[in-house]
């Protein structure tokens, strides 16, 4: 058993069927020694007496907000909460797998920039009884500050017969330097507690392994004078590293017609423009990739041809 | 990537070429460790993230961006005891700090250099032949030396005489490539920087 | 006393369908995630699939994927494996397990896919 | 398809040590526990060692489980004629839990 937080306790159960479970000791903090009672959330039913209350925990019925009270008061809350663990494996029962970039990918987290500054999301199917608490630090052994806010729903989806949450949050490592050499990745860490269950989550990366820049800006096209062909130019996003000539990115521009089906003609650039035939009803696309760094590339940013 | 991409300009900055020659042999070497090694821990979120030039060189400190001088993260430890005289000085505008980038580009080198090469002479010892420092890369790094023409005086190659742990080899050849992988990416940063100013 | 107890199993026809059932007792079944197993005659253990505590999950082994379904009635502390598109290699004794560092199974139960 | 291999079969004659390997990988025993089952001709598989080198309640102390790296072992010391039996490892795979993953077994005689 550990404190989670103030009067929040998480116990650690080897979860299978008959499983023996944990003895748990209760000590009631207050300075009285006689007259006390123990209850078990909103029931009125006398578990024990005595300043400590020593309970075997083995499943959610177990588990709950324990109080001692004297005399009609309350004297203090214990709050029982349980992490599963299913033949050594922590159960992962409160988030989705995204399965994207592997299996098991519970955390998913982009930066735009080298700054320090990510944000990592999560899906889940449930709507009530959630809460989530994000830490984050550089390394482990030795940890460094990343700062993270508190995490929001950000997104609500309907899939098939059930409907999905996507929470997200902000992370700022706090002295970053957007050109140093990442030896130690970012640690995050999130806390969900779903009723009385607890899980926790984890991701490891490295920032420029998170790397999605946002899409290029400005897209224009110039028709060429007695030509079927067009100049594309685009800027380097807003929110992309500066100086642009040490943080270069690399372009790709894709002429791509009304139909699906039709074939796609791609350019590769590390400039800001390209000659491309534009055909009618076609649409002209670019998007951006570190150029020395091949992490994400990002959303397309798209312009009609006529 | 399938890259029918513009060729650089004759005339640009000589090193801008043969840093982007780099960048792309050691990541071409990196894929074909972790494509052939691939039940050996080579992969970035198994291997220790080690840098052999660490407190020898300071590449990134020295190869800051202007830009970037204002960012007191980015300023914990300049240093600034680098050679000066270097062929790819090609402008009169280049500063003292410039040529202690360069310099400092040029020990990162020579340092993976003589370790690879040290790795090597082990690989080619192994009965099962399993993987071996591309030549291409080798040259590449000797390349971009030659073009950087800095005066050092030369490291010896670490000859050892036990017999090698050739699993240990292959792991260290993994932490090798991904470091230099990340420096070299630094390497060709700078080198655009440079060239665009 | 936990008891896993099986039915459902015999001979079918290629191309048919069967359905196996797991009726547990003996403790909470709707908490734990359970598995089906089969063991073809003469050969090794195979897993088949596994579903959540409370069916929210399912998972398959390829070899069946897309034939067969995993699904449970909390209710009625029942575990069901249907199999559809029976084949000459789903022959095996089929078991089902609870899931955890212990654990139970049932008694197993045979289905023969034979023209 | 098996990923875990173990010998197809092992003998000993009665109070011999006889020991089954369980050859895995790092994305398997590497990561994960390791458990061992008994099976005794048309009977369900028993569980023998389980996290490793944990034994339940009830199985002989002969029987003794260990994991290093990418392998693990079940050793039978003393090793009896009731012993004569089917033996599999289990682990899982740390991209495809919460399947189970099955060694190709290893049958166990009992020789005199």
């Known amino acids: 058993i550990w404190e989670l937080k103030k009067d929040v306790y998480v116990v650690e159960l080897d979860w299978y069927p008959d499983a023996p479970g944990e003895m748990v000791v209760l000590t009631c903090d207050t300075p009285e020694e006689d007259g006390i009672t123990w209850t078990l959330d909103q029931s009125s039913e006398v578990l024990g007496s005595g300043k400590t209350l020593t309970i075997q925990v083995k499943e959610f019925g177990d588990a709950g907000q324990y109080t001692c009270h004297k005399g009609g008061e309350v004297l203090s809350h214990s709050l029982l909460l349980l992490h599963k663990k299913e033949d050594g494996i922590w159960s992962t029962d409160i988030l989705k797998d995204q399965k994207e970039p592997k299996n098991k990918t519970f955390l998913r987290c982009e930066a735009k920039n080298y700054s320090g500054r990510f944000t990592c999301w999560w899906l889940t199917t449930i709507s009530t009884d959630l809460t989530f608490s994000v830490k984050s630090s550089r390394g482990s052994s030795d940890p460094q500050g990343v700062t993270c806010g508190a995490a929001t729903l950000s997104a609500e989806r309907v899939r098939g017969d059930n409907k999905e949450y996507e929470y997200s949050v902000e992370c700022q490592e706090d002295s970053a330097c957007p050109a140093a050499e990442e030896s130690l990745p970012i640690e995050v860490m999130v806390d969900a507690v779903h009723k009385l269950k607890y899980e926790n989550y984890t991701s490891s990366f490295f920032i420029r392994d998170i790397i999605k820049p946002d899409p290029p800006k400005n897209l224009q096209l110039k028709p060429l004078k007695n030509s079927r062909q067009v100049e594309v130019s685009w800027e380097y996003p807003d929110t992309w590293s500066t100086p642009h000539s040490y943080f270069s990115l690399t372009f790709c521009v894709q002429v791509q017609g009304k139909s699906k089906r039709e074939k796609k003609d791609r350019v590769f650039t590390d400039k800001t423009s390209a000659t491309v035939i534009c055909r009618k009803n076609a649409s002209i696309s670019v998007r951006a990739q570190d150029r020395y760094y091949s992490s994400s590339w990002s959303e397309w940013a798209s312009v009609p041809c006529s | 990537r399938n890259l029918p991409v513009a060729t650089p300009d004759p005339g640009m900055f000589p090193c801008l070429h043969h840093s982007q020659n780099l960048l792309r042999a050691v990541s071409n070497m990196l894929q074909k460790a972790r494509q052939t090694l691939e039940f050996y821990p080579c992969t970035s979120e198994e291997i220790d993230h080690e840098d052999i030039t660490k407190d020898k060189t300071s590449t990134v400190e020295a190869c800051l961006p202007l830009e970037l001088t204002k960012n007191e993260s980015c300023l914990n430890s300049r240093e600034t005891s680098f050679i000066t005289n270097g062929s790819c000085l090609a402008s009169r505008k280049t500063s003292f700090m410039m040529a202690l980038c360069l310099s400092s580009i040029y020990e990162d080198l020579k340092m993976y250099q003589v370790e690879f090469k040290t790795m090597n002479a082990k690989l080619l010892m192994d009965p099962k032949r399993q993987i071996f420092l591309d030549q291409n890369m080798l040259a590449v790094i000797d390349e971009l030396m030659q073009a950087l023409n800095f005066n050092s005086e030369t490291v010896p190659q670490k000859s050892s005489l036990e017999e090698p742990d050739f699993y240990k080899t292959k792991i260290k050849l993994c932490i090798l490539l991904h470091a230099f992988r990340i420096r070299a990416v630094t390497i060709d940063r700078v080198m655009s920087y440079l060239n665009a100013s | 006393q936990v008891q896993l107890v099986q039915s459902g199993g015999g001979v079918v026809q290629p191309g048919r369908s069967l359905r196996l059932s797991c009726a547990a007792s003996g403790f909470t079944f709707s908490s734990y995630g359970m598995h089906w197993v089969r063991q073809a005659p003469g050969k090794g253990l195979e897993w088949v699939a596994f579903?959540?505590?409370?069916?929210?999950?399912?998972y398959y082994a390829d070899s069946v994927k897309g034939r067969f379904t995993i699904s449970r009635d909390n209710s009625k502390n029942t575990l069901y494996l249907q199999m559809k598109s029976l084949r000459a290699e789903d022959t095996a004794v089929y078991y089902c397990?609870?899931?955890?560092?212990?654990?139970?199974w049932g008694q197993g139960t045979m289905v023969t896919v034979s023209s | 398809s098996y990923v875990l291999t173990q010998p197809p079969s092992v003998s000993g004659t009665p109070g011999q040590r006889v020991t089954i390997s369980c050859s895995g990988g790092r994305s398997n025993i590497g990561s994960n526990t390791v458990k061992w089952y008994q099976q005794l001709p048309g009977t369900a598989p028993k569980l023998l060692i389980y996290k490793n080198d944990q034994r339940p309640s009830g199985v002989p102390d002969r029987f003794s489980g260990s994991k290093s790296g990418t392998s693990a072992s079940l050793a039978i010391t003393g090793v009896q004629a009731e012993d004569e039996a089917d033996y599999y490892c289990q682990s899982y795979d740390r991209g495809t839990h919460p399947a189970l993953l099955f060694g190709t077994g290893t049958k166990v005689t009992v020789l005199g």
């Open positions: 397990k609870t899931h955890g560092s212990h654990d139970n």
């Open positions: 579903i959540r505590y409370d069916g929210s999950n399912k």
